[in-house]
Interface confidence: medium
């Protein structure tokens, strides 16, 4: 194994303005009794989590994609966005076996895979929130302004999706540029960010930009759009449309529950590193532990959307049953009477809501 050259890595890097200590020798009162701490979780437990999420996500998102692609007739705009959402989750899930293996054996896959799987993880998050922001805009235009523009111009939706993937790649670019396999002296190699001599400055710039454009901005768009959408639905007593919106609201709610805690902690970490929040040893350790505790929710998210569709999305269940019946896996008699080959919800005109 190649040995790690300390001079090449983060020279003059000012990681912090505090110091940590391990077990101190007796009677050394002037040494800070603090050391880096993160959650102590058994690596095999982590591997089990990865394996479960991988299997659930692979099965669930494959089915979602199958049902949407199978239902060509009456496929809504939201369906197209959810297809892309499932695609992003599936791509991320495919990297989980690699992360699981790395947890046990260290990063044995080299720099190329290090860059690729890290990129997929970032792209999954950014495309996810940007697609949900687009769904919120689409629902806002359809319900609040009764606009049919997007629905009538499907090429525009394809352009929007392409733009989302491009922007997600752009936001995830720092990972592609700076991640590499780092060979350490006494432990297994790691897939890590090496930004050269200006790590702290780079990390701040490359964290603030994605957090602003890839999290805070889409979040504000979603809050604005769904705020007005809900107000319109309740004011107009549009019960049918409200029911049709249940799945979308559930998808957004689960996304926020899974990703908001992590990104709020990350924001606190960013504020502390930029000295906008006073940095203390206790605070640093609390943030480290919170990052570990909240990141698992983000990982779990990739397998949750199909479960939402299965439990809340009536049309998804119908669509799935239709496919099973088409292939003779179940009797056609067991199909609901109103089952159609898509999972478009009931709503007026071209403003259909998915699942």
């Amino acid at each position: 194994m190649q040995s790690f050259n300390f001079e090449d890595f983060w020279e003059n890097e000012d990681f912090s303005n505090y110091s940590y200590s391990s077990d101190l020798p007796p009677s050394l009162p002037d040494v800070a009794p603090c050391r880096p701490e993160s959650l102590e979780i058994n690596k095999y437990f982590v591997v089990i989590i990865y394996a479960l999420v991988f299997l659930l996500s692979l099965l669930g998102n494959s089915l979602v994609m199958l049902v949407i692609l199978h239902s060509r007739v009456g496929r809504s705009i939201t369906d197209v966005y959810l297809l892309n959402l499932a695609m992003a989750d599936l791509l991320f899930a495919l990297t989980l076996p690699i992360w699981a293996a790395a947890k046990v054996n260290g990063w044995i896959f080299g720099t190329f895979l290090c860059k690729v799987v890290s990129l997929l993880k970032e792209v999954n998050f950014y495309s996810g929130i940007l697609l949900l922001a687009c769904i919120s805009v689409d629902r806002y235009l359809a319900i609040v302004h009764a606009t049919r523009t997007l629905t009538q111009k499907r090429y525009l939706v394809k352009f929007v999706c392409l733009s989302i993937w491009s922007l997600s790649l752009l936001l995830a670019l720092p990972v592609l540029l700076f991640r590499r396999t780092v060979y350490l002296t006494y432990i297994s190699p790691v897939c890590y960010e090496d930004m050269g001599n200006n790590t702290a400055k780079w990390r701040m710039v490359l964290r603030i930009l994605p957090q602003t454009f890839g999290f805070i901005l889409p979040l504000l768009i979603m809050l604005f759009c769904y705020g007005f959408t809900l107000r319109t639905l309740f004011k107009a007593h549009m019960g049918q449309k409200h029911r049709a919106m249940r799945v979308i609201f559930a998808v957004v709610l689960i996304f926020l529950l899974c990703w908001l805690p992590y990104h709020l902690v990350l924001l606190a970490d960013t504020l502390m590193r930029t000295r906008l929040i006073n940095e203390t040893c206790q605070r640093r350790n609390n943030i480290d532990q919170a990052l570990d505790a909240t990141e698992i929710l983000g990982i779990l998210h990739s397998c949750l959307n199909p479960l939402i569709y299965a439990f809340i999305g009536q049309k998804f269940r119908h669509g799935l049953l239709k496919i099973l019946a088409t292939h003779g896996l179940i009797s056609k008699d067991s199909l609901p009477k109103d089952s159609r080959p898509s999972f478009v919800g009931s709503s007026s005109g071209h403003t259909s809501t998915t699942l």
Partner: nanobody, 126 residues
Framework: EVQLVESGGGLVQPGGSLRLSCVAS????????MGWYRQTPGKQRELVAD???????NYIDAVKGRFTISRDNTKNTVYLQMNSLKPEDTAVYYC????????????????????WGQGTQVTVSS
Amino acid sequence: EVQLVESGGGLVQPGGSLRLSCVASGSIVRINTMGWYRQTPGKQRELVADITSGGNINYIDAVKGRFTISRDNTKNTVYLQMNSLKPEDTAVYYCNAEIVVLVGVWTQRARTGNYWGQGTQVTVSS
């Protein structure tokens, strides 16, 4: 968990020599400064010498010309070569290092910590 292990201490006659070694192990990304401190009973510890990753060296006046600090970055090790030892050099010698370590369950992050060894006894006596 990061550990610093010292070795090389012992009993030596005045004018003799000893070589102390300190090896750092664990989830180490990088070691910034490594140094040697000493402490005698009832007194505060004092810095003997330290060396940065860039090779900048600092000694206290009492040991200049007699002690030499060096480090091997590839082995995460710091050495203290002690020549012309005097009875007043008798103390417990502690290794100290400012280390960038990896923390994190899902995503690994770098954090700086200040770590200490358990100490090695150096006795200069005839």
